[in-house]
């Protein structure tokens, strides 16, 4: 190796200056005694190198790039060799930003997978490899005092969410949770959440069903629908409130919301609808009065309201 580049820093803030030095050893005798060292950033020659012979006979060129505006580029030092450039050495330069503070950290407890799933927004692109780590600890109080640390949760590349498995959770006890972002230019931490996993529980929705008509029950009135729902069994002991939404299948009508309904109602007569009209209905529930997240909307149920009962003048015969 005839030449060697060293740089002030291989990774810098985007737009910051960078200084590089290229040294050519004396024993590269096939070279000119006074070779002119050239610099290239990517494909572009860079002027401004200051060259000197050192006391040991080596040649050194120093260049300062006033603003590194490429997020990634190769800097090389070279010599003219015949009609071509002979590259002596090259280094990869990277430029970007330290990680912004991750924001909008939120979590939900999935009782089926027995895990606490947390997600966040990573902030603007840093242009550098940036790692995110979900960090947490158990706390007996309001997270002012730290208890046992929980194993770090590292998301898969490019993902902004991570799942803490049940073995690291304590239900009905607070946890401190935050996201740490780190790259070559710095580290940042999100504000800390303090939560009991049960307070962010997200239930599965009930299953909507048509109410079986019983012989003694009156049929639904015109513009009414009778429906029932089967609660999600594993969430049955959690007090909840629910809400229905409905819209006519045809047309561009938006959803109309009905609620709150107690989960225990299990059946409901919905009135004030258009007669002889097909409706789409869905239900969702939330832990209540204790905190929780709304479930997803249930799969749709499609029902048709009955015809309006004929009024007296409809009985007249038209000849």
């Amino acid at each position: 190796e005839c030449g060697h580049i060293s740089v002030s820093a291989p990774i810098v803030h985007l737009g910051d200056p960078i200084t590089a030095s290229c040294i050519i050893k004396q024993n590269c005798s096939h070279l000119d005694p006074e070779p002119q060292i050239l610099w290239r950033l990517g494909a572009e020659l860079q002027p401004g190198g200051r060259q000197q012979r050192l006391s040991d006979g080596t040649q050194e060129s120093i260049i300062t790039l006033p603003h590194l505006n490429h997020t990634q580029a190769f800097l090389s030092c070279a010599l003219n060799w015949g009609n071509s450039l002979q590259i002596l050495d090259q280094v990869e330069l990277r430029a970007g930003y330290p990680p912004a503070i991750p924001h909008n950290l939120s979590c939900l407890m999935n009782l089926t997978t027995s895990s606490l799933i947390c997600q966040w927004e990573p902030g603007p692109e840093t242009h550098l490899p940036t790692s995110f780590t979900l960090k947490s600890f158990k706390s007996r109080g309001n997270c002012q005092t730290q208890g046992d640390s929980i194993l770090d949760c590292v998301p898969k590349d490019g993902q902004s969410h991570c799942s803490i498995p049940r073995k690291h959770l304590l239900l009905y006890q607070n946890m401190g949770i935050w996201v740490q972002a780190e790259n070559a230019l710095g580290t940042s931490m999100s504000p800390q959440l303090c939560l009991d996993p049960m307070d962010v529980v997200k239930l599965e929705p009930p299953m909507l069903r048509t109410m079986d008509p019983s012989p003694e029950a009156a049929p639904p009135q015109a513009g009414c629908l009778q429906l029932s729902w089967e609660p999600w069994q594993p969430g049955l002991h959690i007090n909840q409130k629910c809400e229905l939404r409905h819209k006519p299948q045809r047309g561009e009508a938006s959803w109309a919301l009905v609620g709150p309904l107690p989960l225990e109602a299990l059946q409901y007569e919905l009135c004030g609808l258009l007669p002889a009209t097909a409706y789409t209905l869905q239900i969702r529930c939330i832990r209540w009065p204790l905190p929780g997240h709304w479930s997803d909307w249930s799969p749709s149920l499609e029902l048709r309201t009955t015809e309006r009962a004929p009024t007296h003048h409809h009985h007249h015969h038209h000849h």
Partner: antibody, heavy 118, light 107 residues
Framework: EVQLLESGGGLVQPGGSLRLSCAAS????????MGWVRQAPGKGLEWVSS????????PYADSVKGRFTISRDNSKNTLYLQMNSLRAEDTAVYYC???????????WGQGTLVTVSS | DIQMTQSPSSLSASVGDRVTITCRAS??????LNWYQQKPGKAPKLLIY???NLQNGVPSRFSGSGSGTDFTLTISSLQPEDFATYYC?????????FGGGTKVEIK
């Protein structure tokens, strides 16, 4: 301190009836599911019935369905189990218990013995 | 109905021993598995809920693990007051079902 106190057990003839009560204190009774679990002499635990916080949902074990009725009076903080058409195999200690949100029983009452025998 | 199978039905152990009791559900129940301890003439007492959560006041030598169909209760170092019968119970859905029990006796 959460406390549950059962009463109403005793000796009854086959085909007879009995009503068990469970007085609750130390927690907001109206917010919790409650349940009955029984244990025949020398045997394991068997769930009998549960009731939702406002009484609208009342699942039963197949072995007692149609014969037993669970109910509650939230104004009196009391849980009941009305047992009709009693059989010898209903002989057991009956425990009332508070149900946790994910379906565990805690705490339990001290139990009341029901003996069905002629 | 979900059947809960506990093993062994009884075991003899000495103070200081590590004891493991297993419970198998006939179908997946996620983490809806609870463990109870019962001493003769007394009401059962909750030890572990939702498979691995230690109930308040229960010594840390008790631990629970597993999910789906296979669960374990471990007593890391058996103490004299731990000789009792242990039951697992499913709370995934009705009917709620108990295992047959494991009686832990003094060797």
């Amino acid at each position: 301190e959460v406390q549950l106190l059962e009463s109403g057990g005793g000796l009854v003839q086959p085909g007879g009836s009995l009503r068990l009560s469970c007085a609750a204190s130390g927690f907001t009774f109206s917010l919790y599911w409650m349940g009955w679990v029984r244990q025949a002499p020398g045997k394991g635990l068997e769930w009998v019935s549960s009731i939702s916080s406002s009484g609208g949902v009342t699942p039963y074990a197949d072995s007692v369905k149609g014969r037993f009725t669970i109910s509650r009076d939230n104004s009196k903080n009391t849980l009941y189990l009305q047992m009709n058409s009693l059989r010898a195999e209903d002989t057991a200690v009956y425990y009332c218990a508070k149900l946790g949100e994910l379906g565990w029983f805690d705490p339990w009452g001290q139990g009341t013995l029901v003996t069905v025998s002629s | 109905d979900i059947q809960m199978t506990q093993s062994p039905s009884s075991l003899s152990a000495s103070v200081g021993d590590r004891v493991t009791i297993t419970c198998r559900a006939s179908q997946g129940i996620s983490s809806y598995l609870n463990w109870y301890q019962q001493k003769p003439g007394k009401a059962p007492k909750l030890l572990i809920y939702y498979a691995s959560n230690l109930q308040n006041g229960v010594p840390s030598r008790f631990s629970g693990s597993g999910s789906g169909t296979d669960f374990t209760l471990t007593i890391s170092s058996l103490q004299p007051e731990d000789f009792a019968t242990y039951y697992c119970a499913n709370s995934w859905g009705y009917p709620l079902t108990f295992g047959g029990g494991t009686k832990v006796e003094i060797k």
